[in-house]
């Protein structure tokens, strides 16, 4: 059951984080203009990682995509391709981790398929996360760097009366959504990892077998109870003993069958 | 076509208070941002009031700020201007205005004469 | 506050004769997003309100003749009249609309010589 809650909660939080990452790749407000010297700017303009715009007090917005490919920064074509590994990483582990799901039946499938199914998907969760982490930060470094440069040359023409205010650019929302999304597919991933343990076949199973001391006789009555980690299941079937005690698959075939010796 | 028709001027104390109404046809008053412009006689113009579309904004400049409030009733297709504390120099004609692209006034109504004088 | 100079501040000239006009702000109305320059040329006749002529220094309004041109960038702009007719006979302002508050040059009366 705890595995069952474990692999869906992984699912449904990795679920979410790459809506997320899908969503912060597609938001406009990657960086936005900074407001500090002029809160009450006429004309706002914001940026994202395949067009810029601006919006006009009156209510207009424009935006323009970036169609030139080359003429980019690196920088902004290495997040753009870590925020699409991310994705395409992401979307990937969504579609093994809805096969890996103990509580969807595929044919015949074994347990063991499933639990490495699950962990495939947990890493790729894992590392779609930290693409989107990676991404989000390596922009977030670019418009720190950008921002300090143009503080120091904030105005950059000084003849006279004249002066150009140099447009700073600061956080948008995109990011804090990269972050949050990216940490949550984290988590999803870890948990995918977590409950593949649980959903692993386990060679030996100890069984509990209970002993009645009457006199001198002793009696043992059989009991499908594991003695192990409570996740594994006995694939093999292995009998203890063979007049007595069974595996728990056993006990559940026969219910009303008891064995004494 | 659209128009813009400004009412509520006239003559006050230095002092006192009125609201200056416009309002609006024939074009989709709820997705413009509205200003108020001034004109002194024989004076160059000034802006006065800016309320963004979804009455979330507004923008004034030092000169009637505290004193002036913009707003609007989308539903009544109305833009209002209360003027509190009224001095001699903002005796103007008063003007709505629609803005535009590029932030610029589109649409103008006639103006309102506002005399402010004891 | 951003400061708007208009010159002249009245200009006579010849009907079908060029007429050009200049304003100057203070700081640069560039927008750096969208590479446009906020400024908005308006014609005012007497006893009328003001008419958008052309925004973003250059566009013209709909409905506007095509002999009034908007040119210039940053600080220095030109509304040029490329051939005066009569009914061009007005004052012409020039407006930042790039930063609040929005600020009106002084305006410059147009004449027939």
């Known amino acids: 059951m705890a595995v069952t809650a474990c692999q869906g909660l992984g699912f449904v939080v990795s679920l979410i984080g790459i809506a997320g990452i899908i969503a912060a790749t597609c938001m406009d407000q990657w960086s936005t203009q900074d407001l500090y010297n002029n809160p009450v700017t006429a004309v706002f303009n914001y940026q994202g990682l395949w067009r810029s715009c601006v919006r006009e007090s009156s209510g207009f917005t424009e935006c323009r995509g970036y169609f030139t490919l080359l003429g980019l920064p690196a920088m902004l074509q290495a997040v753009r391709a870590l925020m699409i590994v991310g994705i395409v990483l992401g979307a990937i582990g969504l579609l093994v981790s809805i096969f890996a799901l103990k509580c969807i039946r595929i044919g015949s499938m074994e347990d063991s398929a499933k639990a490495n199914m699950t962990l495939t998907s947990g890493i790729m969760f894992i590392v779609s996360g930290l693409c989107a982490i990676a991404g989000v930060s390596v922009f977030a470094n670019m418009l720190v760097t950008n921002f300090w440069m143009s503080t120091a040359n904030m105005y950059t023409g000084m003849g006279g009366m004249v002066q150009t205010v140099q447009t700073r650019y600061t956080f948008g929302a995109a990011l804090f959504v990269g972050w949050v999304a990216g940490g949550l597919t984290l988590i999803g991933g870890v948990m995918m990892c977590i409950a593949c343990r649980g959903l692993a076949p386990e060679e030996t199973n100890y069984k509990a077998v209970s002993y009645h001391a009457s006199g001198h006789s002793v009696a043992y009555k059989p009991g499908g109870f594991k003695a192990s980690t409570g996740f594994g299941s006995n694939t093999k079937n292995k009998k203890i003993y063979d007049g007595g005690a069974r595996t728990e698959d056993e006990v559940q075939s026969y219910p009303s069958k008891h064995d004494y010796v | 076509e659209v128009q813009l028709l400004e009412s509520g001027g006239g003559l006050v104390q230095p002092g006192g208070s009125l609201r200056l109404s416009c309002a609006a046809s024939e074009f989709t008053f709820s997705n413009y941002a509205m200003s108020w412009v001034r004109q002194a006689p024989g004076k160059r113009l000034e802006w006065v009031a800016t309320?963004?579309?979804?009455?979330?904004?507004?923008y004034y400049p030092d000169s009637v700020k505290g004193r002036f409030t913009i707003s609007r009733d989308n539903s009544k297709n109305t833009l209002y201007l209360q003027m509190n504390s009224l001095r001699a120099e903002d005796t103007a004609v008063y003007y709505c205005?629609?803005?535009?692209?590029?932030?610029?006034?589109?649409?103008w109504g006639q103006g309102t004469l506002v005399t402010v004088s004891s | 506050d951003i400061v708007m100079t208009q010159s002249p501040d009245s200009l006579a000239v010849s009907l079908g004769e060029r007429a050009t006009i200049s304003c100057k702000s203070s700081q640069s109305l560039l927008n750096s997003g969208n590479q446009k320059n906020y400024l908005t040329w308006y014609q005012q006749k007497p006893g009328q309100p003001p008419k958008l002529l052309i925004y973003w220094a250059s566009t013209r309004e709909s409905g506007v003749p095509d002999r009034f041109t908007g040119s210039g960038s940053g600080t220095d702009f030109t509304l040029t009249i490329s051939s005066l007719q009569a009914e061009d006979v007005a004052v012409y302002y020039c407006?930042?609309?790039?930063?609040?508050?929005?600020?009106f040059g002084g305006g410059t009366k147009l004449e027939i010589k």
């Open positions: 205005a629609g803005l535009g692209r590029g932030n610029a006034m589109e649409y």
């Open positions: 407006q930042n609309a790039y930063s609040y508050p929005f600020t």
């Open positions: 309320i963004s579309s979804g009455r979330s904004s507004t």
